[in-house]
Every structure is written in structure tokens, then in C-alpha cells.
């Protein structure tokens, strides 16, 4: 088809443009370029033929034009007026015609434009600020940049007049900045000169330096005052209410006791007409004083109170030292010291923080030591500890129970025997037990200070029986090669053998097998899959001997490297394709499959009917287990043969 | 593409038995195994039991044991679900589901389900 | 048998609204757990399994987190279109056993 492709589409003004024809009928007798969407005699403007290579203008023909063999036509030195529809009329040599019809846009060369403002020194949080991008141009698009970057999304930036206008509310000394406007059109894209805004602002509250307010007789005094403050703050000075000067250090030599007393700095913006004092009190010290811990906590609670540790009193140029247990202090994350080394905080204190701490002031010729400082900190009560920890007892023996609940103040305790209360001691004594005596022993551990209690309770059983003992372990699904398992024969009794079994069979010897606390607990390192196995503790005593049920361990592990079976790797074409993929894995492997490295189904048997050579390529098996973490693939390549008489072809399942 | 189309809905009383069917197509039926879940009336999902339609393999919950028997035709690929001795707290929408894989996958395709009402 | 406790049972909240439904195992399942929608009058559609794979063609606003015993479901911009109940499912060995479900609603 006959189609007009204009280069460019977009044309600025006094450059040219070229009307492109494609696929360009053959056997022509010549052609004719129109002005619009249709042929129109009083609209050409160039008709060419091919016979005699002749080109005549028509009416609409303005002497820019070049019409070229091809049939494509050149408008050069474009004007607003070009803008528009082209048609071109062919005609063949059997005299039928064809047409087709193009378009391009002419924009101006934009100028380069310019901001103008509606206020050049707005007052913070008082005034609004207008930016209009001059000229106003049609057909533009208009862009504003702040310190080169795009505008920030903000609710004080308002854009209004298609773009053209940028309006900043409540005007804040963070607007400072530079800004820069931008028009484009299709064919252009200028960019204004930047503006910057010069925001009043201030003065802010001044800040006086240095900020440590005690001195020692004889030195030199050198305040310094700022406040932030557009146009720069003018500064003045008073002492004890007395105007001294109108400057921003202010610096008296050589000061004794009397210089004491409230200093003052005023800063004033004469622009905005504003005021901002700050007044700091200045102490000078005859000699320098004996330091002197203070806290801001006497009690702290553990693990939910900080404690702040100041060394008295502050002193220019001084070197603060600190102590703690005798020892200068230790690096840790809970121990932070100020800037100036005068205040040691303690976070999240805990019962091992108890100090002492000192402090030392360095002076030119020793240091001063302040009074050690313990600190007081409330924990507890813990879960109590009711020993011994036997649970089994035979009848006739004494009982006897010792509790202890580490708490700051100590604990107050409590015993209760099946939810009655007995005494109010730590230990607890019955003589010449029975089978009655068999019940919930619970201690009850009380600290007065923090209200907080906790309790233990122990099943004391009074039997000449052994009970049936059971396994408890510390790790029910433990990972092959990572984990560790511990097994405990329960319950713990006094007098009594513990003995074990794996499969019926006593312990193997094994560098991985351990048995401690009295052959009461039996611990296996790095399981394997083989220790998947049954496990029995026994107990037995002069009276009497018993077994556990059997706990079978369940090892986690794989996904071991698959195995895709069958084997074959070359097949003829029309077989069917049945791989089987198989990992040993507990839980049983997620199976997925790839060909070609693209995904395919999540089964263990990949069936393909009647492949053909277009089913060559790689087959992956992926195999994946969560509950160990791991995964684990294998890749096979599969040929597959047009021809039937290949030796050492699979037939296919 | 894949579908299950099971049975219609059936009505049966106390102590009878129902055999619901689940016909399977557009994959490989042998490849993927296939569960059984129902719904009581404005309940949740309860998961009943699956087979394997490749060897015939099947597990049931603990709760169904001794009343649900599952079979399978890979002539017709449809597999069965029989629940004997219903009792009314049997009326359910009983829903056949395709495993997106094999071993330790979630349900990828349903049937529609089938509405087995139990009443005297 | 492994318990799946869900929660809430049900929830209100407006289109946009990020709404988060949590799923608790009574026994670690790793991270074989899957979630599903269902609408009224229609089976359950798998979303999300192993915890955090989004099933295909389902929308990226839904997504999954967690592994062990606890477990969320997230829909970052809630729709009128994802009225429906959710059930969370454990995938670990049979048997496969169900969260009661949480009935989400458009306030």
C-alpha cells in the first residue's frame, strides 16, 4: 500500500522537511504532490512526469519545494503556514490512479524564557511567593527545577496557569534555593537563567559557646553568640542585666569570683524586626572542688531502667576520668559517656552493675577522685530453685526442701503443699515421709520492692516403686550434619542407675554418642539419618527397675543429588518419554522439572507422548525440602533421532 | 486445560452409603494425586483423604478411617470416593482437588463439588 | 494432628486498605503452608504456597510471609473484588489440615 511518511513529524520553523513515499507502484506514468487531504487543481504544487523528467509547479507551489524521482518531496525553510496534510496523486500507465496522504507539524524555535517574582525577599511562615515563566507561548509545555532537581511533592508548592506559574505558601528559609523554569515544544526545549530566593528569616533562639558555664578563677572568658538569621543577626551583649557591647564574642581576661553572675545575648534582625535573647549563668570557682557523683536514679529496675551518672560540678577545660569496680571502663554497648566525658549512662541496667563508680577531675598537677557511688539496682525475684532436684523418694527418708530466688532486696518465701500454705521459710522440713506425703510441692518467691512474684513447682512422689521413666529432647526434628540432640531420662530420683537402648541393643560406641549427669541425659552430636532409631531409657534401684516407651528420632534431611531413571539419554522419534525422578529426603522433596530450562510441572514423573527431535535439550529435576532448607538438582540431556535404525536407541516406555 | 467434573448432587438417609465420582482431564492423570475435601453449610474446608492414581495408594483422616473408600479408573481417569453409614452431619459439598505436585503441595485445580444431603 | 488457628475470624475495612490475616501452626511446618480465597457460591482458588510463592495469575497485591508456626497473609490495597473467606492450609505430609477461615469484608 502507498503510505507518506513524514521526517520528522515535528518541524521547526525554517528548517525543512521530507515527505518519504513508500512502496511506490511500478509502471508509472508520473505523479502530483497536493496541499490537503485531496486532490485539488487549485491546491497542487508540484506535478512530476516520468517520461520526460519533467517537473511543473501548480499554484500552491511556493518555490521551496523539491520533488525528487522517487516521488518523495522536499519542503525546505518551513513556515507556520506548512503545517498540515500533503496528498499524492500517482498515476500508473494503465492510467489508474492511486493516492496517499501525509502530515507533519511546524512549532517555533522556543526563546529562552525568564522568571519573574512577585516578592524578592518574602518573610518565613508569613509570606507567599509567585514564579511566572515568561513568555507566555502557545503549544508549550512548562517545567520548573529546584537545585536542578524535579519539584518535591510539598502542599505549600502550588503549580497554577497551565505550569506557568509555581506559587510557594508559608515561605520557610528551606526554600532558599535555586530555581529554574523550562518550556518545550516538540521541537524545542529552553531553559531560563536560575533564580535564587532570598528568604528572611530569624532570628532563632541564639545559642552561646561553649557551653560548659563553670570556671576557674584566673582563666579567660570567651563567649560566642549565633542565631541563625537572614539577613546576619546584630548582637549585643548584657551582664547581670547591664548592656556591656554590641558584638558577637564577647571576652573578658583574667576572671575572678565577681565575674559570676547571668549573661545575656540579644539577637536582631533588622529586616523582620525581630528580638531572640538567651541567657546562661556563668559560676567561677576559686579553686577547683572536690567532684562529686550524682544520679538520676537511686533504684533503677532491671532490664527497664537507665541510669545517668554525672560528675559534678562542670568545668571549662577539664578532663573528666571515670571508674568502675576499681577498673577504668569497660567497652560495652550499654555504656555511653557524653562529649564531654562528665555523664556515664548505664541502659537497660542490670544486677552485675552495681559499681563502684568514680569520677576524677584532671587538674595540671594530680586528679581528684570523687566518693565511690554504688548503685542499687532492683531485679528479681528469678524463678526459684527448689533443691535437691530429685522428684522419687522412698518412704521413711527425710524431706527436705531448700529454695532460693535471687532478688534484690532478698525474697521473701512461701511453700505450699497442694495448693495449701505450709510456712513462710526457705527450707522445709517433714521427717519420716510416706506415701502421703507424695503431692505438688510449690515455693513461692516475693519481692517486697517491686511487688513481683514467681513460683516453682516439684512433684514429689514417695513410692518403694520406681515409676515408668519417659524421654524428653530438646530437639523433636533435628537437621542431619547441623544439629545436636539431647535426651533426658525423667524423672530425676535419688539412689537410681539410668540405662540406655538404641534398637534393643545397648549404646554403641560412637565418638558422636555422650552420656553425662549421671548417664541421665544421652546426648547425640551431628545426627544422621541413621540415628533415626528407636530410643529407651531405664531406671532401676535396690527395690525396683523400669522402662520408658520408645522415642523414635525423626532426622530431617536432603534433598540427596535426584536420580532420573531410566537412564537412556537417546530416544527415536515417536516413543513416549517417561523420566522418574528420585531424591532421598525427609520430608519428602517438592519435585519440579525444566526443559530447556523452562518450567514445568511440580511432579515426580515427567510424561511426554510421541516425542519427535524438537524435544532435544536438557531435562533438569529440581528437588527442594523447607524443613531442612535445602535443595538440590540434576540435569540430563536427551537426543532424540528422526531416524529408525540408529543402534543403541531407546524405544521409549 | 485442566478440569475435574464430578457426579450431581445426590440425596441419601441415615446409614446409606454415596459414591461420588470426579472425572479428570487436559493433564496427565497418573502424574498428579488427587484429594477429597468437604464443606459443611457455612463451615470451613475439611480435608478427608487422597490417592495416588498412578499405584492406588491412599491416606484418610484419622476421623473418616473405616467409612471412606477411595478408587480410581485410569481407563476413564476418574477416581471415587464411597463414604458409608451417613449420618446428617455428612451433608457437606464434597470437593475433588488436583495436587500442583507430588509430596508436600497444596491444591491447584477443584471441581465444581458435589452436594450430598443426608435426611431421614 | 496439626492445628491451624487463623485470626481474625472476620474483618471490615475500605478499598485501599491494607488488611493482614495470620495463621498460627500448633507444630512448626517449615515453610509449607498455602492460603486460599473463596468466594461466595464458588470453590477455593490456591493463592499463595510455600508461604511466600504467588501462584500465577493472581494479583501482586496479595503476598506471604512468615515460616515455622507463624504465618500472614497480606493484601496491600484491598479491593472490591477480594470479598471473599480466606483459608490458610499446612502442606507438611498429610494430613492437610485447614484454618477455620477469615470472612473478609468492604466496610
Known amino acids: 500500500k502507498l503510505t507518506i511518511e513524514s521526517t520528522p513529524f515535528n518541524v521547526a520553523e525554517g528548517k525543512e522537511v521530507l515527505l518519504l513515499v513508500h512502496n511506490l507502484p511500478q509502471h508509472l506514468f508520473g505523479y502530483s504532490w497536493y496541499k490537503g487531504e485531496r486532490v485539488d487543481g487549485n491546491r497542487q504544487i508540484i506535478g512530476y512526469v516520468i517520461g520526460t523528467q519533467q517537473a511543473t509547479p501548480g499554484p500552491a507551489y511556493s518555490g521551496r519545494e523539491i520533488i525528487y524521482p522517487n516521488a518523495s518531496l522536499l519542503i525546505q525553510n518551513i513556515i507556520q503556514n506548512d503545517t498540515g496534510f500533503y496528498t499524492l496523486h500517482v498515476i500508473k500507465s494503465d492510467l489508474v490512479n492511486e493516492e496517499a496522504t501525509g502530515q507533519f507539524r511546524v512549532y517555533p524555535e522556543l526563546p529562552k524564557p525568564s522568571i519573574s517574582s512577585n516578592n524578592s525577599k518574602p518573610v518565613e511562615d508569613k509570606d507567599a511567593v509567585a514564579f511566572t515563566c515568561e513568555p507566555e507561548t502557545q503549544d508549550a509545555t512548562y517545567l520548573w527545577w529546584v537545585n536542578n532537581q524535579s519539584l518535591p511533592v510539598s502542599p505549600r508548592l502550588q503549580l497554577s496557569n497551565g505550569n506557568r506559574t509555581l506559587t510557594l505558601f508559608n515561605v520557610t528559609r528551606n526554600d532558599t534555593a535555586s530555581y529554574k523554569c523550562e518550556t518545550q515544544n516538540p521541537v524545542s526545549a529552553r531553559r531560563s537563567d536560575s533564580v535564587i530566593l532570598n528568604v528572611l528569616y530569624g532570628p532563632d533562639a541564639p545559642t552561646i559557646s561553649p557551653l560548659n558555664t563553670s570556671y576557674r578563677s584566673g582563666e579567660n572568658l570567651n563567649l560566642s553568640c549565633h542565631a541563625a538569621s537572614n539577613p546576619p543577626a546584630q548582637y549585643s551583649w548584657f551582664v547581670n542585666g547591664t548592656f556591656q557591647q554590641s558584638t558577637q564574642e564577647l571576652f573578658i581576661p583574667n576572671i575572678t569570683v565577681n565575674n559570676s553572675g547571668s549573661y545575656t545575648c540579644q539577637a536582631h534582625n533588622s529586616d523582620t524586626g525581630l528580638n531572640r535573647t538567651t541567657v546562661t549563668t556563668i559560676t567561677v570557682y576559686a579553686e577547683p572542688p572536690k567532684p562529686f557523683i550524682t544520679s538520676n536514679n537511686s533504684n533503677p529496675v532491671e532490664d527497664e531502667d537507665a541510669v545517668a551518672l554525672t560528675c559534678e560540678p562542670e568545668i571549662q577545660n577539664t578532663t573528666y576520668l571515670w571508674w568502675v569496680n576499681n577498673q577504668s571502663l569497660p567497652v560495652s554497648p550499654r555504656l555511653q559517656l557524653s562529649n564531654d566525658n562528665r555523664t556515664l549512662t548505664l541502659l537497660s541496667v542490670t544486677r552485675n552493675d552495681v559499681g563502684p563508680y568514680e569520677c576524677g577531675i584532671q587538674n595540671e598537677l594530680s586528679v581528684d577522685h570523687s566518693d565511690p557511688v554504688i548503685l542499687n539496682v532492683l531485679y528479681g525475684p528469678d524463678d526459684p530453685t527448689i533443691s535437691p532436684s530429685y522428684t522419687y523418694y522412698r518412704p521413711g527418708v527425710n524431706l527436705s526442701l531448700s529454695c532460693h530466688a535471687a532478688s534484690n532486696p532478698p525474697a521473701q518465701y512461701s511453700w505450699l503443699i497442694d495448693g495449701n500454705i505450709q510456712q513462710h521459710t526457705q527450707e522445709l522440713f517433714i521427717s519420716n515421709i510416706t506415701e502421703k506425703n507424695s503431692g505438688l510441692y510449690t515455693c513461692q518467691a516475693n519481692n517486697s520492692a517491686s511487688g513481683h512474684s514467681r513460683t516453682t513447682v516439684k512433684t514429689i512422689t514417695v513410692s518403694a516403686e520406681l515409676p515408668k521413666p519417659s524421654i524428653s529432647s530438646n530437639n523433636s526434628k533435628p537437621v542431619e550434619d547441623k544439629d545436636a540432640v539431647a535426651f533426658t531420662c525423667e524423672p530425676e530420683a535419688q539412689n537410681t542407675t539410668y540405662l540406655w537402648w538404641v534398637n534393643g541393643q545397648s549404646l554403641p560406641v560412637s565418638p558422636r554418642l555422650q552420656l553425662s549427669n549421671g548417664n541421665r541425659t544421652l546426648t547425640l552430636f551431628n545426627v544422621t539419618r541413621n540415628d533415626a532409631r528407636a530410643y529407651v531409657c531405664g531406671i532401676q534401684n535396690s527395690v525396683s527397675a523400669n522402662r520408658s516407651d520408645p522415642v523414635t528420632l525423626d532426622v530431617l534431611y536432603g534433598p540427596d543429588t535426584p536420580i532420573i531413571s531410566p537412564p537412556d539419554s537417546s530416544y527415536l522419534s515417536g516413543a513416549n518419554l517417561n523420566l522418574s525422578c528420585h531424591s532421598a529426603s525427609n520430608p519428602s522433596p517438592q519435585y519440579s522439572w525444566r526443559i530447556n530450562g523452562i518450567p514445568q510441572q511440580h511432579t515426580q514423573v515427567l510424561f511426554i507422548a510421541k516425542i519427535t527431535p524438537n524435544n532435544n535439550g536438557t531435562y533438569a529435576c529440581f528437588v527442594s525440602n523447607l524443613a531442612t532448607g535445602r535443595n538440590n538438582s540434576i540435569v540430563k540431556s536427551i537426543t532424540v533421532s528422526a531416524s529408525g535404525t540408529s543402534p543403541g536407541l531407546s524405544a521409549g516406555a | 486445560q485442566v478440569q475435574l467434573v464430578q457426579s450431581g448432587a445426590e440425596v441419601k438417609k441415615p446409614g446409606a452409603s454415596v459414591k461420588v465420582s470426579c472425572k479428570a482431564s487436559g493433564y496427565i492423570f497418573t502424574s498428579y494425586w488427587l484429594h477429597w475435601v468437604r464443606q459443611a453449610p457455612g463451615q470451613g474446608l475439611e480435608w478427608i483423604g487422597y490417592i495416588n492414581p498412578q499405584t492406588g495408594y491412599t491416606s484418610y483422616a484419622q476421623k473418616f478411617q473405616g467409612r471412606v473408600t477411595m478408587t480410581r479408573d485410569t481407563s476413564t481417569s476418574t477416581v471415587y470416593m464411597e463414604l458409608s453409614s451417613l449420618r446428617s452431619e455428612d451433608t457437606a459439598v464434597y470437593y475433588c482437588?488436583?495436587?500442583?505436585?507430588?509430596?508436600?503441595?497444596?491444591?491447584?485445580?477443584w471441581g465444581q463439588g458435589t452436594l450430598v444431603t443426608v435426611s431421614s | 494432628d496439626i492445628q491451624m488457628t487463623q485470626s481474625p475470624s472476620s474483618l471490615s475495612a475500605s478499598v485501599g486498605d491494607r488488611v493482614t490475616i495470620t495463621c498460627r501452626a500448633s507444630?512448626?511446618?517449615?515453610?509449607?503452608l498455602a492460603w486460599y480465597q473463596q468466594k461466595p457460591g464458588k470453590v477455593p482458588k490456591l493463592l499463595i504456597y510455600n508461604a511466600k510463592n504467588l501462584v500465577e495469575g493472581v494479583p501482586s497485591r496479595f503476598s506471604g510471609s512468615g515460616s515455622g508456626t507463624d504465618f500472614t497473609l497480606t493484601i496491600s490495597s484491598l479491593q472490591p473484588e477480594d470479598v471473599a473467606t480466606y483459608y490458610c492450609?499446612?502442606?507438611?505430609?498429610?494430613?492437610?489440615?485447614f484454618g477455620q477461615g477469615t470472612k473478609v469484608e468492604i466496610k
Open positions: 492450609q499446612h502442606h507438611y505430609g498429610t494430613p492437610y489440615t
Open positions: 482437588a488436583r495436587e500442583y505436585g507430588n509430596y508436600n503441595y497444596p491444591l491447584d485445580y
Open positions: 507444630e512448626n511446618i517449615y515453610g509449607y
